[in-house]
């Protein structure tokens, strides 16, 4: 079953997904899609990376972490109830049926009514965008001379909500990870 993550309407949601590149810059294509992972790639793609860069993304979806180090966790900006559902993170490891796919369930709750406004840290400022290119058609990929020996890690559910960027940092840097493969 899918690991569940929660956010409130108006907040930024964080869906963790990680892998460990065999060497710096030796990246693996990754896609994020709305909906469970299908047989190939991702359905309803919201973001893609290739061996070099983020080559496609849609508004409100971006990578805050250092994807060049394997942090391909997805941030969804200013969520609404319509953002609820299953998301697919697919790490496309070269080889015969080697893809690692993770289905993450995002639950959006209505915003809490508070008696007085409280100042929250700016998630975007804490995690500046790292996206540098935008694709307008299918990506050109470069064939790597040798296939990377990849160890994947997927972070476990440590908290139901990410309230601010400090907690996001704590989660990402925590040792409580599951090693796949």
């Amino acid at each position: 079953s899918e690991v569940e993550y929660r956010a409130e309407v108006g907040q930024n949601a964080y869906l963790p997904c990680f892998y460990t590149p065999a060497a710096p810059g030796n990246l693996v294509p990754v896609c994020w899609g709305k909906g469970a992972c299908p047989v190939f790639e991702c359905g309803n793609v919201v973001l893609r990376t290739d061996e070099r860069d983020v080559n496609y993304w849609t508004s409100r979806y971006w990578l805050n972490g250092d994807f060049r180090k394997g942090d391909v966790s997805l941030t969804i900006e200013n969520v609404t109830l319509a953002d609820s559902g299953i998301y697919c993170c697919r790490i496309q490891i070269p080889g015969i049926m080697n893809d690692e796919k993770f289905n993450l369930k995002l639950v959006i709750k209505p915003a809490k009514v508070t008696p007085a406004p409280t100042r929250q840290r700016d998630f975007t400022a804490a995690f500046p965008r790292m996206l540098t290119t935008r694709g307008h058609g299918p990506a050109e990929t470069q064939t790597l001379g040798s296939l990377p020996d990849i160890n994947l890690t997927q972070i476990s559910t440590l908290a139901n909500e990410l309230r601010d960027s400090r907690l996001a940092n704590d989660l990402r840097d925590s040792g409580a990870t599951i090693r796949i493969g």
């Epitope: 190939f40 080889g95 299918p138």
Partner: antibody, heavy 123, light 107 residues
């Protein structure tokens, strides 16, 4: 106009080998997943194997992956299926098909198919 | 493997009829379902993908519906060129699997 033309089929004895080819034209071949699907005489469709854009990721029907190898040559706009240790039950028309694709979708269904090439395995 | 079961396996109908073919998946496949049409001696043709999206160039008399495990393809008013075999295909689980087919014949 998108065209997929298979070749390489024919009669082969059990235990023999064949290499099927699919020549693609009318589109940027390297942008698309490609797939082989087969159809035994009078029967339904059966997925055989698929390959990603640059050939680094391949996917097979479990029962075939030890005998069949899918590959591609993007410089030649060609898809291949190497079939070894052929059996009578491999007798079928083999179709090459293009995975429908644009950036917001996944290539899990097939929008263009070749005319097929018949492989007959018989002694 | 996910099993796809089509019904009926064959169907006789007349030009102008409304017909529905159903496809049942052995487990939840969300909306990851495709329909193809195949005429004798020809290669399959994509009709509907993601359960309900009509492929380019497919007449609007064709429509797809369903999600989860139950799906259907409806032809609102049969035309002579619609008599053919129809296959569903799931693309949620590996391996990709097809239904056994439905043969649509002229009554």
């Amino acid at each position: 106009e998108v065209q997929l033309v298979e070749s390489g089929g024919g009669l082969v004895k059990p235990g023999g080998s064949l290499r099927l080819s699919c020549a693609a034209s009318g589109f940027t071949f390297s942008d698309y997943y490609m797939t082989w699907v087969r159809q035994a005489p009078g029967k339904g469709l059966e997925w055989v194997a698929s390959i990603n854009y640059d050939g680094r990721n391949t996917y097979y029907l479990d029962s075939l992956k030890s005998r069949f190898t899918i590959s591609r040559d993007n410089a030649k706009n060609s898809l291949y299926l190497q079939m070894n240790s052929l059996r009578a039950e491999d007798t079928a028309v083999y179709y090459c098909a293009r995975g429908y694709y644009y950036y917001g979708s996944s290539p899990n269904y097939f929008d263009y198919w070749g005319q097929g090439t018949l492989v007959t395995v018989s002694s | 493997d996910i099993q796809m079961t089509q019904s009926p396996s064959s169907l006789s109908a007349s030009v102008g009829d409304r017909v529905t073919i159903t496809c049942r998946a052995s487990e939840n496949i969300y909306s990851y379902l495709t329909w193809y049409q195949q005429k004798p001696g020809k290669s399959p043709k994509l009709l509907v993908y993601n359960a309900k999206t009509l492929a380019e160039g497919v007449p609007s008399r064709f429509s797809g519906s369903g999600s989860g495990t139950q799906f259907s393809l409806t032809i609102s008013s049969l035309q002579p060129e619609d008599f053919a075999n129809y296959y569903c295909q799931q693309h949620y689980g590996t391996p990709l699997t097809f239904g056994q087919g439905t043969k649509l014949e002229i009554k």
